[in-house]
């Protein structure tokens, strides 16, 4: 008995070959002897029932001259899994068709961190093995249900599932979209008074995007977090619902989500968490954002540089006179110089690879007042 594997919704070709390699009479039947189609000597395809009943069944007329009389079944259904009989030249050829189906749990659009379940439906009596490969090359294998927990952004794309049965295989392609922000976390470094731009680009595109969001902020100086802004998203259009008076954030009306803080001030330095709840989805998308603020000041005979916000303990804060060696350099959040000499002083926040933030302050001779450029 020949075995043919098929995929639900697609087409299968069941073979039937003549030893003569020429056109001959043939008939395809179900195992209960009901006729499906055939050719009775006039080169005309005759169907065994009403057109509506047999419109999915066909043959390849062009192949008949070569002694090949395949049965083509279009728009395969799971119930097409059965034995088919080809009668020709006083012999019967049995062909077993097994139709498989691989589906993703409920939805192919899943939030980052959620689980993906891929389910194989197979005909009774079959014992297939299945292996699925993610777009980033991760292989999962198992029985009729395969699960991937904690979906990552890199899991977005085409998953390829290979079903193996009796050394024959059939391949399924399933497009999965992982709903997430492009970045899990970002840090913005600003001098006091500068405008701050926060951007929250999404890592996916969909036709219509509807939901609601909120930015909660934990300022370093505050004992508790507070909601800075809430907004709605309707078909990719952003509308602000509520915003605090201090700070008065502004929000862009289009995607990507974009927030502007008019001024970076020490009291705003800290960490925020933007959440986005999408319509018809359980769970929320999250992006962490951090703000580090630097202030350089001169009070009487003391030049001070301070930073506020979530900095790595490896960062170095330095005060130096332009084009000279650093006068003071510490892995702390504040440094100062007593009786600084006149000139342009630089406050630098650096790590092993770069200067992250720089603020200049002009120290005038002692009889003048300082100027901040």
């Amino acid at each position: 008995k020949t075995l043919v594997l098929g995929k639900e919704g697609e087409s299968a070709e069941l073979p039937c070959e003549s030893s003569q390699k020429k056109i001959t009479v043939f008939t395809w039947k179900f195992s209960d002897q009901r006729k499906i189609l055939g050719q009775h000597g006039k080169g005309v395809l005759i169907r065994g029932g009403s057109p509506s009943q047999f419109d999915r069944f066909d043959s390849k007329k062009g192949a008949w001259e070569k002694g090949s009389f395949p049965l083509i079944i279009n728009k395969l259904k799971m119930e097409d899994s059965q034995t088919y009989i080809c009668e020709l030249e006083n012999r019967k050829e049995e062909v077993e068709l097994w139709v498989f189906k691989v589906t993703a749990n409920s939805d192919t659009h899943l939030l980052q961190g959620q689980s993906l379940t891929l389910t194989l439906e197979s005909p009774p009596g079959s014992s297939p093995s299945v292996q699925c490969r993610s777009p980033r090359g991760k292989n999962i294998q198992g029985g009729k249900t395969l699960s991937v927990s904690q979906l990552e952004l890199q899991d977005s794309g085409t998953w390829t599932c290979t079903v193996l049965q009796n050394q024959k295989k059939v391949e399924f392609k399933i497009d999965i979209v992982v709903l997430a922000f492009q970045k899990a976390s970002s840090i913005v470094y600003k001098k006091e008074g500068e405008q701050v731009e926060f951007s929250f680009p999404l890592a996916f595109t969909v036709e219509k995007l509807t939901g609601s969001g909120e930015l909660w902020w934990q300022a370093e100086r505050a004992s508790s977090s507070k909601s800075w802004i809430t907004f709605d998203l309707k078909n990719k259009e952003v509308s602000v619902k509520r915003v605090t008076q201090d700070p008065k954030l502004q929000m862009g009306k289009k995607l990507p989500l974009h927030l502007t803080l008019p001024q970076a001030l020490p009291q705003y330095a800290g960490s925020g968490n933007l959440t986005l709840a999408l319509e018809a989805k359980t769970g929320k998308l999250h992006q962490e954002v951090n703000l580090v603020v630097m202030r350089a000041t001169q009070l009487q005979k003391n030049l001070t540089c301070e930073v506020w916000g979530p900095t790595s303990p490896k960062l170095m804060l330095s005060l130096k006179l332009e084009n000279k060696e650093a006068k003071v350099s510490k892995r702390e959040k504040a440094v100062w110089v007593l009786n600084p000499e006149a000139g342009m002083w630089q406050c630098l926040l650096s790590d092993s690879g770069q200067v992250l933030l720089e603020s200049n302050i002009k120290v005038l001779p002692t009889w003048s007042t300082p100027v901040q450029p």
């Epitope: 976390s185 970002s186 840090i187 470094y189 951090n290 580090v292 900095t311 790595s312 303990p313 490896k314 960062l315 170095m316 330095s318 650093a326 350099s329 926040l349 650096s350 790590d351 092993s352 690879g353 770069q354 992250l356």
Partner: antibody, heavy 122, light 107 residues
């Protein structure tokens, strides 16, 4: 391509000095911190020192502080490790590695040299 | 200095197995932890940085996670080339410190 090559290893008596070099190529050297790590025979890895991108800041493991000095020459794309008052326990393979620093948050050593062997023995 | 306690020190497994290695930090290091693989006679190779970020070119069977001060490296579906030594490294603060290492060999 991006690479680091160590040199200067050898056999030396306790109390003597040795100077290791790390030559970089294939990247903008002056934008990266460079570390020295070491691995004693059959043992785990140990961090030794780092020098920042501009040479202004240097940090050392307690076990080498006061004996080893790290320096760099950005015009020659090299980092040196001057090792004085060497001890038997300094015997190891010494690796230099490039540190990537992003946003003052993400740090990692993505490029390593193949190592140079230092043997301190009387 | 921050101490990193890595376990197990050695591990025997078979191709296809799922393997986990853990590192515990003696204090809060936020996400400042990387995982490195080392084969005999070779330099270490970066696998995961900042707790859970997969380095370019590293197979996706490697993943990292964190719970408080406990960090985990997971290899899902061991391949023959994965038998090696694995080290965690805290890069949160100086001095950087490594875990003692885990030697992964064939069962």
């Amino acid at each position: 391509q991006v690479q680091l090559v160590e040199s200067g290893g050898g056999v030396v008596q306790p109390g003597r000095s040795l100077r290791l070099s790390c030559a970089a190529s294939g990247f903008t050297f002056s934008s990266y911190g460079i570390h020295w790590f070491r691995q004693a025979p059959g043992k785990g890895l140990e961090w030794v020192a780092i020098i920042w991108f501009d040479g202004t800041n240097k940090f050392y493991a307690d076990s080498v502080k006061g004996r080893f000095t790290i320096s760099r020459d950005n015009s020659k794309n090299t980092v040196n490790l001057q090792m004085n008052s060497l001890r038997v326990e300094d015997t190891a393979i010494y690796y230099c590695a490039r540190e990537v620093a992003i946003q003052g948050y993400y740090y990692y050593m993505d490029v390593w040299g193949n190592g140079t062997t230092v043997t301190v023995s009387s | 200095a921050i101490q990193m306690t890595q376990s197990p020190s050695s591990l025997s497994a078979s191709v296809g197995d799922r393997v986990t290695i853990t590192c515990r930090a003696s204090q809060d290091i936020r996400n400042g932890l990387g995982w490195y693989q080392q084969k005999p006679g070779k330099a270490p190779m970066l696998l995961i940085y900042t707790t859970s970020n997969l380095q370019n070119g590293v197979p996706s069977r490697f993943s990292g996670s964190r719970s408080g001060t406990d960090f985990t490296l997971t290899i899902s579906g061991l391949q023959p080339e994965d038998f090696a030594a694995y080290f965690c490294l805290q890069d949160y603060n100086y001095p950087y410190t490594f875990g003692q290492g885990t030697k992964l060999d064939v069962k």
